[in-house]
């Protein structure tokens, strides 16, 4: 199946690469603006220059385009622990990341929060912390894994998800009331 093309894609496909069709005159192909610039005025005729202007501070275009406005630079979400890796320039958006010994958890496709990598106290590092993944820990005997932290089996009750990991300890606890919460 042929993918459905939007009006802009249809118009652009009539012109060779790097050019776009004039919005008022479909017999004219204008040269697209370079990254870091935006379309101020369409070319007046065939073979004539497109009027492109450089993006103002706080805005950018990262590829050749015929946008009427530059895109606003992203701001790093400080409240989510993000830090600026590189500043926005006219041809590149802000790059945000996390500090050393932190990993990213994505709440949505483009929004992430920084969390500290687990140190695997009371356990051993099975897999090291990576950009988008916390350390994977293996816990020592008498401890169970809870949100990637090794927690003492004394915090485990019979009805909870830790019971299999703490089975010997649980069976040794007799006559204690189990509310199912910690």
């Amino acid at each position: 199946l042929v993918p459905h093309l939007g009006d802009r894609e249809k118009r652009d496909s009539v012109c060779p690469q790097g050019k776009y069709i004039h919005p008022q005159n479909n017999s004219i192909c204008c040269t697209k603006c370079h990254k870091g610039t935006y379309l101020y005025n369409d070319c007046p005729g065939p073979g004539q220059d497109t009027d492109c202007r450089e993006c103002e501070s706080g805005s950018f275009t990262a590829s050749e385009n015929h946008l009427r406005h530059c895109l606003s630079c992203s701001k790093c979400r400080k409240e989510m622990g993000q830090v600026e890796i590189s500043s926005c320039t006219v041809d590149r958006d802000t790059v945000c990341g996390c500090r050393k010994n932190q990993y990213r958890h994505y709440w949505s496709e483009n929004l992430f929060q920084c969390f500290n990598c687990s140190l695997c106290l009371n356990g051993t590092v099975h897999l090291s912390c990576q950009e988008k993944q916390n350390t994977v820990c293996t816990c020592h005997a008498g401890f169970f894994l809870r949100e990637n932290e090794c927690v003492s089996c004394s915090n485990c009750k019979k009805s909870l998800e830790c019971t299999k990991l703490c089975l010997p300890q649980i069976e040794n606890v007799k006559g204690t009331e189990d509310s199912g919460t910690t």
Partner: nanobody, 120 residues
Framework: EVQLLESGGGLVQPGGSLRLPCAAS????????MTWVRQAPGKGLEWVSA????????YYADSVKGRFTISRDNSKNTLYLQMNSLRAEDAAVYYC?????????????RGQGTLVTVSS
């Protein structure tokens, strides 16, 4: 078995308010970050808000910041979403979800959802 049951949805006028509770069972509720996500008709899942296990840290999508408040009552194993100043674009099925930190977005453990309709 993890179970999450959302309720509180319904029809509300623009500018109105709703409170959505989510009852959790089958896991130690207070240990986990929880989140609300929503899905408008014909659209994908959109993250709305998240809260840490203790309730001390809360985060919001830009689209709901200042209007929605996430909270939890660990003694009742219940998560809440207070929605104020509702807009037509807030109409969606709202789901609560248990968060697995790292990577993401992952909303594998989520409830059946509750429908919020915003219309005059």
């Amino acid at each position: 078995e993890v179970q999450l049951l959302e309720s509180g949805g319904g029809l509300v006028q623009p500018g109105g308010s709703l409170r959505l509770p989510c009852a959790a069972s089958g896991f130690t509720f207070e240990w986990y970050w929880m989140t609300w996500v929503r899905q408008a008709p014909g659209k994908g899942l959109e993250w709305v808000s998240a809260i840490s296990g203790s309730g001390g840290s809360t985060y919001y999508a830009d689209s709901v910041k200042g209007r929605f408040t996430i909270s939890r009552d660990n003694s009742k194993n219940t998560l809440y979403l207070q929605m104020n100043s509702l807009r037509a674009e807030d109409a969606a099925v709202y789901y609560c979800a248990k968060v697995k930190l790292g990577g993401g977005p992952n909303f594998g453990y989520r409830g059946q959802g509750t429908l919020v309709t915003v219309s005059s």
